[in-house]
Amino acid sequence: GWVWNQFFVPEEMNTTSHHVGRLRSDLDNGNNSFQYKLLGAGAGSTFIIDERTGDIYAIEKLDREERSLYILRAQVIDITTGRAVEPESEFVIKVSDINDNEPKFLDEPYEAIVPEMSPEGTLVIQVTASDADDPSSGNNARLLYSLLQGQPYFSVEPTTGVIRISSKMDRELQDEYWVIIQAKDMIGQPGALSGTTSVLIKLSDVNDNKPIFKESLYRLTVSESAPTGTSIGTIMAYDNDIGENAEMDYSIEEDDSQTFDIITNHETQEGIVILKKKVNFEHQNHYGIRAKVKNHHVDEQLMKYHTEASTTFIKIQVEDVDEPPLFLLPYYIFEIFEETPQGSFVGVVSATDPDNRKSPIRYSITRSKVFNIDDNGTITTTNSLDREISAWYNLSITATEKYNIEQISSIPVYVQVLNINDHAPEFSQYYESYVCENAGSGQVIQTISAVDRDESIEEHHFYFNLSVEDTNSSSFTIIDNQDNTAVILTNRTGFNLQEEPIFYISILIADNGIPSLTSTNTLTIHVCDCDDSGSTQTCQYQELMLSMGFKTE
């Protein structure tokens, strides 16, 4: 049978030929009659065999990390017969390890983030080195980790590569650290190989700083003309923290006048002082308010850093603005009776300069030929007024400062022209009536109504009468209906077209004004030739028919 021990060849042997071991048949008596052969991958190129002795040699430098075993086949032949002495057999050559690989950190680059002020012992990151040598071969791949840079803030566990905090760190002093870790194989014994890696450790922020005003006093100004909501200036606190931990909120701590407000610009972290109520230089020309600032987000466990909010004082000076004249009222309504003579008094408007210098005021009326105003604000008429032409006047009165004519204010003034009874009532329309020759007494000829151009205080009431002459000799009579209308009736039987073709009746209409006014109005009545039934359709009075729009036969 075959005789051999397990074959080992050390890696990285530089000799041209390294004896690995000997293969032999127990039938080999050493008389050189046997021939040994090596077959398989590596035979002849990596390994050779002495055909006579069966000694195997490695003729190539081997790398265990590349390939750690070779399976070869061996044959032994009797030279004299050419026959196999032993059956072909497989054998294994193992490549034994030497410490020729340094530890390598394959997961580089390393970066870790840990909160500032973390307590001692806090885990930061684990670094792991790999050693290509054989972990089962002595200590060639057994590693020890140590810290080359990073004391006194960090430490590394020698066997695990776990980096921990060994001293509290303040991000506001230093926000990142470079730690250098060394891994040594052979558990650090002589002849060990080493590799290093750098770990960038960044400190994340915790809210351990409150915002603080750098200025204890701010001086701001606001124009008295500024509308509410105006930004009048900014204040700024500083927080050494970053991001969300530096977000702050400003607020008013003291403002007795409740005139100002502070809003926070969360992009710039500035406080914007806002005008909440209009200011008036003449009323108060300076203010003092106190503002405070605190962080927007504060964790419960960090409240100890935020016990007392930082404050600052803000002095606000009101700037005087030359303001336009100010009328006592926003508008005026005056009344004047119609028909009062030119120059009559209408009313007085009054404006003053609100500023301290109290400039005299001049008044004017925009585009009016009917009214005038003097420097005292007295409005008078320049013409007699007729309510029936215009019952209201809308005036625009302008007040101008004498010392600064650009300072102008205008207000509306409404003048109501009051009614006097200066118009008598009159027919509401032109009336032309007719009567049949054969009309009987008491026949209704016409209903009339009246109008009065005057304004009625309560309600117009008109009184209708015939004139004295007509009352005495009239063929007609009038009845007042007591509702501002009256009816005209025949006062006799029968009329003669040839003798009296037309009657002109004078009607008096009086109003209920004080004093009462009366007008005389003429009613024209035509006499018509009518048929027996009294139908006006057959009235043959040509001129009348034409005037009434009838066609004559």
């Epitope: 398989g40 790398d63 590349e66």
Partner: antibody, heavy 120, light 108 residues
Framework: QVQLQESGPGLVKPSQTLSLTCTVS??????????WSWIRQHPGKGLEWIGY???????YYNPSLKSRVTISVDTSKNQFSLKLSSVTAADTAVYYC????????????WGQGTLVTVSS | EIVLTQSPGTLSLSPGERATLSCRAS???????LAWYQQKPGQAPRLLIY???SRATGIPDRFSGSGSGTDFTLTISRLEPEDFAVYYC?????????FGGGTKLEIK
């Protein structure tokens, strides 16, 4: 797990050099115990081993192609490459990259393959 | 170079049947150095068996390998529809590495 992906031109002119790259993901090319190999398959035919490389740069080639083949490795990019010079139409094939277990010689895993056509 | 000869070139069987594929080496090959692969159209080969008889990760137990020296066999005990493909053997016992010509397993 380890994955391999071939890349390179799909068309090469005769007499020129075919160049392919295999990118390894999910593991390091610098791991011991593995060769990184190229295999090709002519259309409708069997598989032919071209050669392999260890991360140290040591190469092993098929003697039938040795004069024209160069395999190289870039451990920083986790890639290895194949160059085949003086190509002819007979080099038209699907080219695969694969990982080889150095002690026992089996291929696992494989890339999905890339067809290279040699034509003018 | 070791030449691997696979037989039959084509094998026609039905699902549920047993398939026996042969791989013969021109020289003796260590069983540690013989592997089998499956290849479906348009796909890369997939490792089935290594060391002549060890199943690769995720390979169903209906696949088995055997043999030594120069004669090696791949057996599929009960064919499933997804098993119809081309099968290759490969050796590492002698340089250069070589593959067999393949056996096409088709549905009957």
């Amino acid at each position: 797990q380890v994955q391999l992906q071939e890349s390179g031109p799909g068309l090469v002119k005769p007499s020129q050099t075919l160049s392919l790259t295999c990118t390894v993901s999910g593991g390091s090319i610098s791991s011991g115990g593995y060769y990184w190999s190229w295999i090709r398959q002519h259309p409708g035919k069997g598989l032919e081993w071209i050669g392999y490389i260890f991360y140290s740069g040591r190469t092993y080639y098929n003697p039938s192609l040795k004069s024209r083949v160069t395999i190289s490795v870039d451990t920083s990019k986790n890639q290895f490459s194949l160059k085949l010079s003086s190509v002819t139409a007979a080099d038209t094939a699907v080219y695969y990259c694969a990982r080889v277990y150095s002690n026992y010689g089996w291929f696992d895993p494989w890339g999905q393959g890339t067809l290279v056509t040699v034509s003018s | 170079e070791i030449v691997l000869t696979q037989s039959p070139g084509t094998l026609s069987l039905s699902p549920g049947e047993r398939a026996t594929l042969s791989c013969r080496a021109s020289q003796s090959v260590s069983s540690s150095y013989l592997a089998w692969y499956q290849q479906k159209p348009g796909q890369a080969p997939r490792l089935l068996i290594y060391g002549a008889s060890s199943r690769a990760t995720g390979i169903p137990d209906r696949f088995s390998g055997s043999g030594s020296g120069t004669d090696f066999t791949l057996t599929i005990s009960r064919l499933e529809p997804e098993d119809f493909a081309v099968y290759y053997c490969q050796q590492y016992g002698s340089s250069p590495l070589t593959f067999g010509g393949g056996t096409k397993l088709e549905i009957k």
